[in-house]
């Protein structure tokens, strides 16, 4: 009972002076509030609240249920309690039976007793099962009991309050605890495609899937930079305790070109937030953009081998290729494949092996592709590098000596006289005329060259060589001069092979 | 014990708005989940969403997405429904119930709020 | 959504007969299922949690049983007290309710 100080108010007093106070179930409960300014008197007990205007509380036949806390208050707002116990054997146990943790929190699971004097007050297992090793209580009889730092492994525990009454055993009605997890990450945001790609009408739809440990987290689609709500649908399951999933899916039933953007799948919790986005392009029809990925100009030396190659984007998918030199298809050396096996991907790869190429297949090689929107085409310009090839070499009714050479690049004749027997021929010698003669003819093949010179400068015996070059190599024709008398003669000419 | 104590009934016009309380005595509140039913006449009954006090973030039935927002009060231990753009076929009596979020069952039920839409 | 199905949606049955109402899911609930008695003009209540678990207070005629998309409640001697509506009710995804079963006297 509080003690008096003179000259400041003083709580209440209370009949019988006493904290607690048992009574037996159906005797009477008599409290005298002693106070010039009383106002009320209140029980609590679950939760529950009872008030009463008169100073004094009388319960005639007492019940279990009037086990509890009364307390008097005065008009100062000081107040005094008396706890007082109903013993009831057949009810020991008042209880509340919904029992809600929230993880590494305390919780009290709410069976006060009726009987102060009971021993062994804890929890026990339903069914005789034991409890969680590591779950610990605390008991009060005025209260319940305490489980300290409710653990996840603890959701969906059966228990009991217990006590021994008279060397028995006595259990409460069961309880269930449900554990409220504690959010410890941020919920895990994953998109069903980082980017799509869409012609104007046709239908956008990305699923964001959000993974949690309760269905309380929070999850949007929110398009970036724009404050517009977003029509969205969602699934979503339990896969098992503390394991929950969503899936919100964004739709776009008929796609514009300004619906273009970043959509971002957003999420948050009570720890945290997370996001992921995808990239929407809508374009308002189909394309196909070709890349080479060597120069469209080749020059490959004869006998080589060439991979013509190109890249290309195409939206939407490819339906048909092909390659095509002098009107005429391949229908194999190619192959066509997409860069990579991502399910967005619209960028491809098409090749043309062309093998010991011969100086006549140089040309044009086009690649040609088509989709349900457009077509497109690219042109690679082939030549065939060529060692020269000594044509004709003649001496002319003119008294001229002709050599006419085909190669590639353009051959250059050059003409040397050796005289007598030497094998070296130093001596150069000025043509008298060099035509190419096939300038103005297809732009792809050997080029042709003609050379002259006058055979009537040359005085002595001795060889005449006629030699064509270009960046390939060089080949040689040769001429042999005899005089007999004032007679020159030709002997038979021939070539020789020089690399 | 624990009781629900719901709203009482209410008659709106098409178009209009409703909001339908639900008070806890006793228990921790804030950790239960609240969730709201409904049941037309003759009719089966309809989760319609629901909230855990503690998390504050409320989970909606699809069919009620956008139309439907529930709340909690959690000094007042009030959980709240309002249903918006009312049509005639939302008469329905609107239960509201312990349970119903993260596997929990519907333990504790309200007695329940009539709402009668008609012009 | 998961779907539930309820069967019968009504039966006759007399006092101490032994009813059977069966639900079954669109897809696997695993034990994600109650089952709820209501009577007219009153609030639902709380028969069986987690398939097979009974209620506290509730008699022990009522039992449970099944998992993942079949289900069963069993009344093994019907009481007066038993005319009611039957609902079951699925927790793993967005909450469905069955049909409800409606048990009336024979």
């Known amino acids: 009972q509080p003690s008096v100080s003179p000259g400041e108010p003083s709580p209440p007093s209370i009949h019988p002076a006493k904290s607690e106070l048992i009574v037996r179930v159906g005797n009477e409960i008599r409290l005298l509030c002693i106070d010039p300014g009383f106002v009320k008197w209140t029980f609590e007990i679950l939760d529950e609240t009872n008030e009463n205007k008169q100073n004094e509380w009388i319960t005639e036949k007492a019940e279990a249920t009037n086990t509890g806390k009364y307390t008097c208050t005065n008009k100062h707002g000081l107040s005094s309690s008396i706890y007082v116990f109903v013993r009831d054997p057949a009810k020991l146990f008042l209880v509340d039976r919904s029992l809600y943790g929230k993880e590494d929190n305390d919780t009290l699971v709410r069976c006060p007793l009726t009987d102060p004097e009971v021993t062994s007050y804890s929890l026990k297992g339903c069914q005789g099962k034991p409890l969680p090793k590591d779950l610990r209580f605390v008991p009060d009889p005025k209260a319940g009991i305490t489980i300290k730092s409710v653990k996840r492994a603890y959701h969906r525990l059966c228990l009991h309050c217990s006590a021994d009454q008279e060397g028995k055993s006595v259990l409460s009605d069961k309880f269930i605890l449900k554990v409220r997890p504690a959010f410890k990450a941020v919920p895990v945001v994953s998109v069903s495609k980082a980017s799509y790609l869409l012609r104007e009408g046709e239908e956008f739809t990305v699923t964001c899937t959000i993974k949690d440990v309760s269905s309380s987290v929070y999850s949007t689609w929110k398009r970036e930079n724009s404050q517009t709500k977003l029509q969205e649908k969602y699934n979503s399951w339990h896969h098992g305790d503390f394991n929950y999933e969503r899936q919100a899916t964004l739709t776009i039933s008929s796609a514009r070109v300004n619906d273009s953007g970043v959509f971002m799948c957003y999420a948050n919790n009570t720890f945290g937030s997370a996001n992921v986005t995808t990239t929407l392009e809508v374009v308002d029809k189909g394309f196909i953009n070709i890349f080479p990925m060597i120069n469209t100009t080749v020059f490959v030396n004869d006998g080589e081998n060439v991979d013509l190659i190109v890249e290309y984007e195409a939206f939407p998918k490819p339906e048909h290729q092909q390659w095509i030199y002098m009107n005429r298809t391949f229908t194999d050396k190619w192959e066509d494949y997409p860069k990579s096996e991502n399910e967005s991907n619209i960028r491809y790869v098409s090749e043309l092996h062309l093998t010991r190429l011969k100086g006549t297949e140089g040309g044009t090689y086009t690649f040609l592709v088509s989709n349900s929107d457009v077509n497109a085409s690219i042109a690679f310009n082939v030549y065939v590098n060529t060692k020269p090839e000594i044509l004709t070499y003649d001496r002319l009714v003119n008294g001229m000596l002709q050599c006419v050479a085909a190669g590639f690049p353009e051959p250059t004749i050059d003409w040397y006289f050796c005289p007598g027997t030497e094998q070296r021929c130093s001596a150069s010698v000025l043509p008298v005329d060099v035509q190419t003669l096939n300038a103005s003819g297809p732009p792809f093949g050997k080029l042709v060259v003609q050379s002259s010179i006058d055979s009537s400068a040359f005085k002595h015996n001795g060889t005449v060589e006629c030699k064509a070059y270009n960046d390939v190599g060089k080949t040689s024709a040769y001429f042999n001069f005899a005089f007999k008398g004032n007679n020159k003669e030709q002997i038979h000419p021939h070539t020789l092979f020089t690399p | 014990q624990v009781q629900l104590v719901q709203s009482g009934a209410e008659v709106k016009k098409p178009g209009s708005s409703v909001k339908v309380s639900c008070k806890a005595s006793g228990g921790t509140f804030s950790s239960y989940a609240i969730s709201w039913v409904r049941q037309a006449p003759g009719q089966g009954l309809e989760w319609m969403g629901g909230i855990i006090p503690i998390f504050g973030t409320a989970n909606y039935a699809q069919k009620f997405q956008g139309r439907v927002t529930i709340t909690a009060d959690e000094s007042t231990s009030t959980a709240y429904m309002e249903l918006s753009s009312l049509r005639s076929e939302d008469t329905a009596v609107y239960y509201c119930?312990?349970?119903?979020?993260?596997?929990?069952?519907?333990?504790?039920w309200g007695r329940g709020t009539l709402v009668t839409v008609s012009s | 959504d998961i779907q539930m199905t309820q069967s019968p949606s009504s039966l006759s049955a007399s006092v101490g007969d032994r009813v059977t109402i069966t639900c079954r899911a669109s897809?696997?609930?695993?034990?994600?299922l109650n089952w709820y008695q209501q009577k007219p003009g009153k609030a639902p209540k709380l028969l069986i949690y987690?398939?097979?678990s009974l209620q506290s207070g509730v008699p022990s005629r009522f039992s449970g049983s099944g998992s993942g998309t079949d289900f069963t409640l069993t009344i093994s001697s019907l009481q007066p007290e038993d005319f009611a509506t039957y609902y079951c009710?699925?927790?793993?995804?967005?909450?469905?309710f069955g049909g409800g079963t409606k048990v009336e006297i024979k």
């Open positions: 897809q696997s609930i695993n034990s994600y």
């Open positions: 009710q699925q927790g793993v995804s967005d909450i469905t």
């Open positions: 987690a398939a097979s």
């Open positions: 119930a312990r349970g119903g979020l993260d596997t929990d069952e519907f333990d504790l």
